[in-house]
């Protein structure tokens, strides 16, 4: 058993049929010694008396808010949560496996630049009685500070019969140099509590590996005289690290119709303009990627050919 | 500790081309190592990230773009003195700070070159003959060093009398390649910045 936060404790249980469970001793936070009784949740049934209560925790029915009272007055609370371990593996029931970039990916993180700011998100099908808390650091043995905000519900989607909820959090490394060469990864730890179930999820990464620039901005077309070709120009996204001559991007320019199966024109360039062939009912799209360290491409920025 | 904007005239910067070749060569070699040593811990997640130049050179600090010198987190107190007569400088306007930056890059390359050559000598003794360093990568390191053209004491190639542990050598190769790729990215960014300034 360990303390998650004040008056909230996590009991780690090996979860299998007829498991013996864990013996837990609760102590009432009071100077009083006599006349103390214990109850669980909203029940008025007295579970025991005295300053300490010893319980055998085996299942979710044994978890919950234990309260010690004296003469109708509440003295203190202890909330017990369960963390299940099945076949030596901690349960991951609360969050959905996003399977990208690999299986057992519950947290996904992205950074728009090298400033040390990043966003992580996760998915769940649970809509109520759900809380998250996020901690992060650079390295684990001698951790350096990363400050994370509160996790918020950022999107809701319908997937077949189920509703899917996306939560996200923004974090900022306390003293980040965009030009630094990372040797210690960022560690992100998410505590998830659903009703009386506790789970924790972690992700470890270098900012350089989670870079995904914003799409290029200000796409403009200029038809070339006596030609089917069009000059398309754009600018670096505002959120990208500066100076751009140091943090350079490379671009992919594509002309395609509405369907992905349609034919296309595609060209890669390090410049902020390119010449392509425009077709009726097609769009010109441009996306960006770090020129020197190939992490993710940005989303496309698009303009219609016409 | 930073690069001033007064840098060589455009088109006078022969090192940019060599630095692009360097990044390409080390990326290819790392990819080859990952594939060939698929049953060894050789991915970014599996290895320890070590920097053999730590406390010996200060490339990131010495080559910091002017725009980032206002960022307290980028300013490190490490100072290193270097010889300053490189041919990539290509202009009398070249500042002392830029010379410091380029000489730091030269020192990085020299250290990695020695490490790679020592390691290759060990790998050539491996009866499995599983992996060797790409001669192209070694040649590209050499070309960039020549383009930088700094005078510097030669570092003797480390020779070891004991029987090499090939497993450890291959893991060290992965660690070195990952670190060198990160440094090659920095070098490419620096050269691009200097070329544009």
């Amino acid at each position: 058993i360990w303390e998650l936060k004040k008056d909230v404790y996590v009991v780690e249980l090996d979860w299998y049929p007829d498991a013996p469970g864990e013996m837990v001793v609760l102590t009432c936070d009071t100077p009083e010694e006599d006349g103390i009784t214990w109850t669980l949740d909203q029940s008025s049934e007295v579970l025991g008396s005295g300053k300490t209560l010893t319980i055998q925790v085996k299942e979710f029915g044994d978890a919950g808010q234990y309260t010690c009272h004296k003469g109708g007055e509440v003295l203190s609370h202890s909330l017990l949560l369960l963390h299940k371990k099945e076949d030596g593996i901690w349960s991951t029931d609360i969050l959905k496996d996003q399977k990208e970039p690999k299986n057992k990916t519950f947290l996904r993180c992205e950074a728009k630049n090298y400033s040390g700011r990043f966003t992580c998100w996760w998915l769940t099908t649970i809509s109520t009685d759900l809380t998250f808390s996020v901690k992060s650091s650079r390295g684990s043995s001698d951790p350096q500070g990363v400050t994370c905000g509160a996790a918020t519900l950022s999107a809701e989607r319908v997937r077949g019969d189920n509703k899917e909820y996306e939560y996200s959090v923004e974090c900022q490394e306390d003293s980040a140099c965009p030009a630094a060469e990372e040797s210690l990864p960022i560690e992100v730890m998410v505590d998830a509590v659903h009703k009386l179930k506790y789970e924790n999820y972690t992700s470890s990464f270098f900012i350089r590996d989670i870079i995904k620039p914003d799409p290029p901005k200000n796409l403009q077309l200029k038809p070339l005289k006596n030609s089917r070709q069009v000059e398309v120009s754009w600018e670096y996204p505002d959120t990208w690290s500066t100076p751009h001559s140091y943090f350079s991007l490379t671009f992919c320019v594509q002309v395609q119709g509405k369907s992905k199966r349609e034919k296309k024109d595609r060209v890669f360039t390090d410049k902020t303009s390119a010449t392509v062939i425009c077709r009726k009912n097609a769009s010109i799209s441009v996306r960006a990627q770090d020129r020197y360290y190939s992490s993710s491409w940005s989303e496309w920025a698009s303009v219609p050919c016409s | 500790r930073n690069l001033p904007v007064a840098t060589p005239d455009p088109g006078m910067f022969p090192c940019l081309h060599h630095s692009q070749n360097l990044l390409r060569a080390v990326s290819n070699m790392l990819q080859k190592a990952r594939q060939t040593l698929e049953f060894y811990p050789c991915t970014s997640e599996e290895i320890d990230h070590e920097d053999i130049t730590k406390d010996k050179t200060s490339t990131v600090e010495a080559c910091l773009p002017l725009e980032l010198t206002k960022n307290e987190s980028c300013l490190n107190s490490r100072e290193t003195s270097f010889i300053t007569n490189g041919s990539c400088l290509a202009s009398r306007k070249t500042s002392f700070m830029m010379a410091l930056c380029l000489s730091s890059i030269y020192e990085d390359l020299k250290m990695y070159q020695v490490e790679f050559k020592t390691m290759n000598a060990k790998l050539l003794m491996d009866p499995k003959r599983q992996i060797f360093l790409d001669q192209n990568m070694l040649a590209v390191i050499d070309e960039l060093m020549q383009a930088l053209n700094f005078n510097s004491e030669t570092v003797p190639q480390k020779s070891s009398l004991e029987e090499p542990d090939f497993y450890k050598t291959k893991i060290k190769l992965c660690i070195l390649l990952h670190a060198f790729r990160i440094r090659a990215v920095t070098i490419d960014r620096v050269m691009s910045y200097l070329n544009a300034s």
Epitope: K263, D265, D270, R279 | -
Partner: antibody, heavy 118, light 107 residues
Framework: QVQLVQSGAEVKKPGASVKVSCKAS????????LHWVRQAPGQGLEWMGW????????EYAPKFQGRVTMTTDTSTSTAYMELRSLRSDDTAVYYC???????????WGQGTMVTVSS | EIVMTQSPATLSVSPGERATLSCRAS??????LHWYQQKPGQAPRLLIY???QSISGIPARFSGSGSGTEFTLTISSLQSEDFAVYYC?????????FGGGTKVEIK
Amino acid sequence: QVQLVQSGAEVKKPGASVKVSCKASGYTFTDYYLHWVRQAPGQGLEWMGWIDPENGDTEYAPKFQGRVTMTTDTSTSTAYMELRSLRSDDTAVYYCAANKELRYFDVWGQGTMVTVSS
Amino acid sequence: EIVMTQSPATLSVSPGERATLSCRASQSISINLHWYQQKPGQAPRLLIYFASQSISGIPARFSGSGSGTEFTLTISSLQSEDFAVYYCQQSNSFPLTFGGGTKVEIK
């Protein structure tokens, strides 16, 4: 599977014209760009131009501008390349090539030998 | 127009050995570079597109790398069926242009 079948070999006199055909099968004809590439005996490859069978748009290499015409007949899924004012240095194997991507060539015809000789 | 230069013109290699073919562009073409193989009496065949992207059905021993002005096609272990002429082609701008080719012959 996607296939391009070209017309047979031709022998032409200098100053004449030649029209080579390229019949496509195994895909929707208008879904791919069609290019013409030639290769003189013992020489390398030389791009001549492309046509979009969907709308008849064309782009020719400057070297062939004014001397070449590329057309298509969607009803028969056939592309044509006509080269006029033939010279002896036009002697080459002419290939049609197709792809969903405009700038490189995924599928090739077997080639048509055109000999220009007096 | 962009001029593509391939080297060497002829490469003599023993079966099982590694072959490295080079292609240089007269100006930077990013990764807009494609490789083809041509055997005598046959049409060319696409091997690699956009400098390093492999084609399904093409053996894994063929790999491409490079960007900007310098590109490499590597055949890791030459098989008898790999002896042919190899062409690079740029698609950075029209007109599309090919290199002069590298003939890979049996040593």
